[in-house]
Interface confidence: low
């Protein structure tokens, strides 16, 4: 399944596109990547509003949506093995295109701690509510979907494309149509800002007439941080309309000549740029020439300017842009150093947490601490990790190796441990005998007892139960029911499998063990040799953060 087009919003130095289509997070990221972008970041309330706007645009085009909730992937993910960090706004998640741990977040609900599998974030839209600025989409984390499996994927995704700069939309001074083609392969006739390297096709005229003229322009970087189309004067001008059509395409003032011609002009304090349409402030700082957080400082007599950087930044070679000083070069941290804009922060490897002597020190996380253990039974802390173990009669299970599952001794690799009936219990097993036989003291073999038509003998007393390792006592030499009495052929099993709880007495209906008087006795035995109780503890399936449904290959609870 592919992604359908798409809505687009361009603002500042970025464009956001929204797409519908059931894709996994990886497929969505790949789609954005093919056109030079990434799944969108939502690093501030302002950016959340831009993303909401593009989603509103997309949803406006979609046919009526009947699902109450709709989800759209964004570029926030947490890799397998990386645990939740409740102290951070992003909770240990990070943006796919890289970048620092941003302060803005808008989680839908408290996150469940799970390090087992990769988790991805989508924007959750409540389609039953009007999409208003005061209701920004919430962040929902969950499984990342699986390629080629639409049922497990969500409704769409949002991409972000970043640019050096933007051109103003072309202004038409008369009837016509502009079509912009962006570097990320979107065409649109209405962009509030047009990204660098976009092409514009202008078709002048009323549309139904033959006298249409076409123009082609490219959004170029004319000077550092100055982007324009290289056009001069308003486009599609017509004496018929003069200044009456779209203010003649002028940015500020439009002055009409007597012959229907007109000129664009600017208000006091502004000057007309080379395109003869746009007005810019005469103050050199008003065009915001300084980038990357630099402050524009006016020179003497207001003629020129210099850019000044905040602490932790320095000017780059262009003297316009601030670049971050990399404090991590000096290795200030014990384990990991993350350079952030204007500073740095120390991080600890998975399995460690901040602490210990000195700035940026790390100490081992005791995953086995009380109330914290991820293991169902035994937990052993190791330096930077942990491992789980199980009590006798259980083996490690679960995709992450933290659960314990009962061993069914009745179907062990060496065959049944009991001579006759075998009953599996949680963490153990016990043997039983058919009517007319009694359990030998070793708790495994059966010896011939007084003939009886009663039910099979019940579970042995606690001290007679089979040992977990299997009894070392040799089996009794007496005939045992699984082999049948000497000289009688084994009959086809006919009784149903007993379904017994661990300590329930055997109360199945009496088995008719002997044929009518005078004919040789025929032994019948249960068709399934053992009664298996429910398997070991299992994680309940739950909300969208349930680990139980993840497809992981983690085996032993490693972080």
């Amino acid at each position: 399944t592919g992604a359908d087009t798409e809505a687009v919003v361009c603002v500042g130095t970025a464009c956001y596109t929204a797409h519908s289509g059931k894709l996994s997070a990886a497929e969505a990221q790949n789609h954005c990547n093919q056109n030079g972008g990434n799944l969108a970041t939502v690093k501030s309330k302002e950016e959340a509003q831009h993303v909401q706007r593009v989603l509103a645009q997309l949803l406006r085009r979609e046919a009526a949506l009947t699902a109450r909730m709709s989800k759209f992937w964004i570029g926030l993910q947490r890799e397998k093995g990386k645990c939740l960090d409740p102290s951070l706004p992003l909770k240990g998640f990070s943006w796919v295109g890289g970048g620092e741990d941003t302060p803005y977040s808008n989680w839908h609900k408290e996150l469940r701690n799970s390090c087992i599998s990769k988790r991805c974030v989508s924007l959750l839209l409540d389609l039953s509510q009007p999409l208003l600025p005061s209701r920004l989409p919430k962040w929902s984390e969950g499984p990342c979907g699986s390629p080629g499996s639409p049922g497990s994927n969500i409704e769409g995704f949002v991409c972000k494309f970043s640019f050096k700069g933007m051109c103003r939309p072309l202004a038409l001074g008369g009837p016509g149509q502009v079509t912009y083609t962006t570097p990320f392969q979107t065409t649109s006739s209405s962009l509030e800002a047009v990204p660098f390297a976009s092409a514009a096709n202008v078709a002048c005229g009323e549309g139904d007439k033959d006298e249409t003229q076409s123009h082609y322009f490219l959004c170029k970087e004319k000077a550092p941080d100055v982007f324009d189309w290289g056009s001069s004067g308003p486009l599609c001008v017509s004496p018929k309309y003069g200044c009456n059509f779209n203010n003649g395409g002028c940015h500020q003032d439009c002055f009409e000549g007597g012959d229907g011609s007109f000129l664009c002009g600017c208000r006091p304090g502004f000057r007309l740029l080379d395109d003869l349409v746009t007005c810019a402030s005469r103050n050199p700082c008003s065009s915001s020439p300084c980038r990357g957080g630099a402050t524009c400082v006016l020179g003497p007599h207001g003629k020129n300017y210099t850019c000044r950087c905040p602490q932790g930044y320095q000017l780059d070679s262009s003297q316009l842009d601030c670049v971050d000083v990399d404090e991590c070069q000096d290795s200030p941290c014990a384990q990991e150093c993350v350079n952030t804009p204007g500073g740095f922060r120390c991080e600890c490897w998975v399995g460690y947490e901040p602490g210990g002597p000195g700035e940026g020190a790390c100490q081992d996380v005791d995953e086995c601490a009380l109330g914290r253990s991820p293991c169902a039974q035994g937990c052993t802390n190791t330096d930077g990790s942990f491992h789980c173990s199980c009590e006798e009669g259980y083996v490690l299970a679960g995709e992450d190796g933290t659960q314990c599952q009962d061993v069914d001794e009745c179907v062990g690799p060496g065959g049944p441990l009991c001579d006759s009936l075998c009953f599996n219990t949680q963490g153990s097993f016990h043997c039983g005998c058919l009517p007319g036989w009694v359990l030998a003291p070793n708790g495994v073999s059966c010896t011939m007892g007084p003939v009886s038509l009663g039910p099979p003998s019940g579970p042995p007393d606690e001290e007679d139960k089979g040992e977990k390792e299997g009894s070392t006592v040799p089996r009794a030499a007496t005939a045992s029911p699984t082999r049948g009495p000497e000289g009688t052929p084994k009959a086809t099993p006919t009784t149903s499998r007993p379904s017994l709880s661990s300590d329930a007495p055997i109360t199945s209906a009496p088995l008719k063990m002997l044929a009518p008087s005078g004919s040789p006795g025929v032994w019948r035995e249960p068709s399934i040799h053992h009664a298996t109780a429910a398997s070991g503890p299992q994680e309940p399936a739950g909300g969208d953060s349930s680990v139980a449904t993840q497809n992981n290959d983690g085996t032993d609870g490693q972080k």
């Epitope: 919003v9 603002v11 302002e46 509003q49 831009h50 909401q52 706007r53 989603l55 509103a56 645009q57 949803l59 406006r60 979609e62 046919a63 009526a64 949506l65 009947t66 109450r68 389609l127 039953s128 509510q129 009007p130 999409l131 208003l132 600025p133 005061s134 509030e192």
Partner: antibody
């Protein structure tokens, strides 16, 4: 062409309920929200609430919550607005209007209005 | 609730002259670059009719003598050359927050 056709005028006693209908035609009924707006004699416009006709989601002005119920019948492309516990203050012309599905939900098509008079 | 205040309450303008109506919101109705502010015209005995949406976008079929401007909290509807058929009450409306609210209306008459 796109039209919203409303039911006829109603006269009600205080404490009673009134149910006004609005039938849509000329466009895909489920692709637009339907809003209700009222206008008391000589007064301005007051938004009552909206309904999404596809899945019947509703959103009401808090002022009317508990008294207003909006419903729809997809088969006849009709939306209903019921207002209960009427008082003389509820005497007004009630308009239905449609808006786009998302974003700036301006009202681009209006019904002609239904006059509701509440009098003992 | 966002309160929308229109001024003046009524306006008398000569035919062919410019008419200007103001609308002030009690808080900003801008959102991510768009103004969630719409203008309607209502003639006696008729429902309102959409003129301008998102502060400055002319609804299709509306004469281009109508124009809208403004952002944040202050908005203006301008009729560049008043015609006899423009006699009506004009309302502004915000759709940025619930409940959607209207201004009190401005009555435009011919002088």
């Amino acid at each position: 062409q796109v039209q919203l056709v409303q039911s006829g005028a109603e006269v009600k006693k205080p404490g009673a309920s009134v149910k006004v209908s609005c039938r849509a035609s000329g466009y895909t009924f489920t692709s637009y929200w339907i809003h209700w707006v009222r206008q008391a004699p000589g007064q301005g416009l007051e938004w009552i609430g909206e309904i999404e006709p596809s899945a019947s989601y509703t959103y009401y002005n808090q002022k009317f919550k508990g008294r207003v119920t909006m419903t729809r019948d997809k088969s006849s492309s009709t939306v209903y607005m019921e207002l209960s516990s009427l008082t003389s203050e509820d005497s007004a012309v009630y308009y239905c209007a449609r808006s786009v599905y998302y974003g700036n939900k301006y009202f681009d098509v209006w019904g002609a209005g239904t006059t509701v008079t509440v009098s003992s | 609730d966002i309160v929308m205040t229109q001024s003046p309450d009524s306006l008398a303008v000569s035919l062919g002259e410019r008419a200007t109506i103001n609308c002030k919101a009690s808080q900003s109705v801008d959102y991510a670059g768009d103004s969630y502010l719409n203008w309607y015209q209502q003639k006696p005995g008729q429902p309102p009719k959409l003129l301008i949406y998102a502060a400055s976008n002319l609804e299709s079929g509306v004469p281009d003598r109508f124009s809208g401007s403004g952002s944040g909290t202050d908005f203006t509807l301008t009729i560049s050359s008043l015609q006899a058929e423009d006699v009506a009450v004009y309302y502004c409306q915000q759709t940025n927050e619930d409940p959607r609210t209207f201004g009190g209306g401005t009555k435009v008459e011919i002088k």
